[in-house]
Amino acid sequence: SSSPTSSASSFSSSAPFLASAVSAQPPLPDQCPALCECSEAARTVKCVNRNLTEVPTDLPAYVRNLFLTGNQLAVLPAGAFARRPPLAELAALNLSGSRLDEVRAGAFEHLPSLRQLDLSHNPLADLSPFAFSGSNASVSAPSPLVELILNHIVPPEDERQNRSFEGMVVAALLAGRALQGLRRLELASNHFLYLPRDVLAQLPSLRHLDLSNNSLVSLTYVSFRNLTHLESLHLEDNALKVLHNGTLAELQGLPHIRVFLDNNPWVCDCHMADMVTWLKETEVVQGKDRLTCAYPEKMRNRVLLELNSADLDCDPILPPSLQTS
């Protein structure tokens, strides 16, 4: 699992009277915020399903794994986790399902060890371009993030404020080139219609990329060439019709890659010939024997690996003078 986990066995719960602890004072070593459970042995704090409306101010300095899931946070302001002394050990932060709709510039500043961040299942209508980079400089200080989980962060369609959701997310990923060290990026279930062409080239350390359950129709303008470390590429449950030669060659050229292509509406006409040939030869596609045609109707449910060139025809396009009404 990509979420922060812990082996915590003994959690101490805070007493309600700690809710009004003075945030200006450094927390006591064994202090646990109200409505949270803490285990110093496991370096873990869990504030889960407690309807918190703000990040607790009195987090213990030892925290390495912080779960703030299932809350009512709404907004992460700049410096939401900035503390004196800083939370220098915090490595894994899970904010999934906390009704966040706004993440402001510098929200994760002053977390020098933060390697794993999960913002999944929040309707992020307003994700600042500088949410992860912390500054608007053309080149920011490198972020320590290695794993960024952004599954199902798309707001409902009527709440997207008339701008490209894909563009907003990509702007945050690329700002200041802060995420050059990112190894895992999960963007599943976000209704992405396209992948902006520059995004992957600027994330050269990626090992794992999950774009499953989106609405991607084509990868024609997406380049995988720079992703020499890429180990897994999840493209299941999209709207892909065919992969063209350029994409096939790039994928084949990646030394460690495994590609997942299940449940796409493959169009088995003459444009599919190159992909079928490639599928028969390649070892990079996992479960390639499960890939089936969706269109045209006469080809529905045919297994791609079982097709030959004679099966893959395109209906001739009649000149206008010969077309009938």
Epitope: T53, A74, D126
Partner: nanobody, 122 residues
Framework: EVQLVESGGGEVQPGGSLRLSCAAS????????MAWFRQAPGKGREFVAA????????RYAESVKGRFTISRDNAKNTLYLQMSSLRAEDTAVYYC???????????????WGQGTLVTVKP
């Protein structure tokens, strides 16, 4: 500027329920948070509850937790406050407000309705 119009106030017995509504003249995209405040006779304006237009996060004053429920209908640009187990101390003018912040302070909100009176008495 968003026009806010409250309705649904009235007189009710202790333990009873009321549902307040607040209709916004348009979708307040610039106002990310909608809230209810109240002002009892001779007292200051007090935060009751708030909800985000997007995402629907909610927050409540301690005094109403478990008794009041705030909600919104995005399609109708309307905010609601379902009040149950009403007490005499809930008697007040209830105001609808819209603002940018996710806050509980009067100053977090820029647009206000005219208020609707809720009276709880035997």
């Amino acid at each position: 500027e968003v026009q806010l119009v409250e309705s649904g106030g009235g007189e009710v017995q202790p333990g009873g329920s009321l549902r307040l509504s607040c209709a916004a003249s348009r979708r307040p995209f610039s106002s990310k948070t909608m809230a209810w405040f109240r002002q009892a006779p001779g007292k200051g304006r007090e935060f009751v509850a708030a909800v985000r237009w997007i995402g629907g996060a909610t927050r409540y004053a301690e005094s109403v937790k478990g008794r009041f429920t705030i909600s919104r209908d995005n399609a109708k640009n309307t905010l609601y406050l379902q009040m149950s187990s009403l007490r005499a101390e809930d008697t007040a003018v209830y105001y609808c407000a819209a603002g940018q912040a996710w806050g509980t302070k009067f100053t977090d909100y820029s647009d206000w309705g005219q208020g609707t009176l809720v009276t709880v008495k035997p």
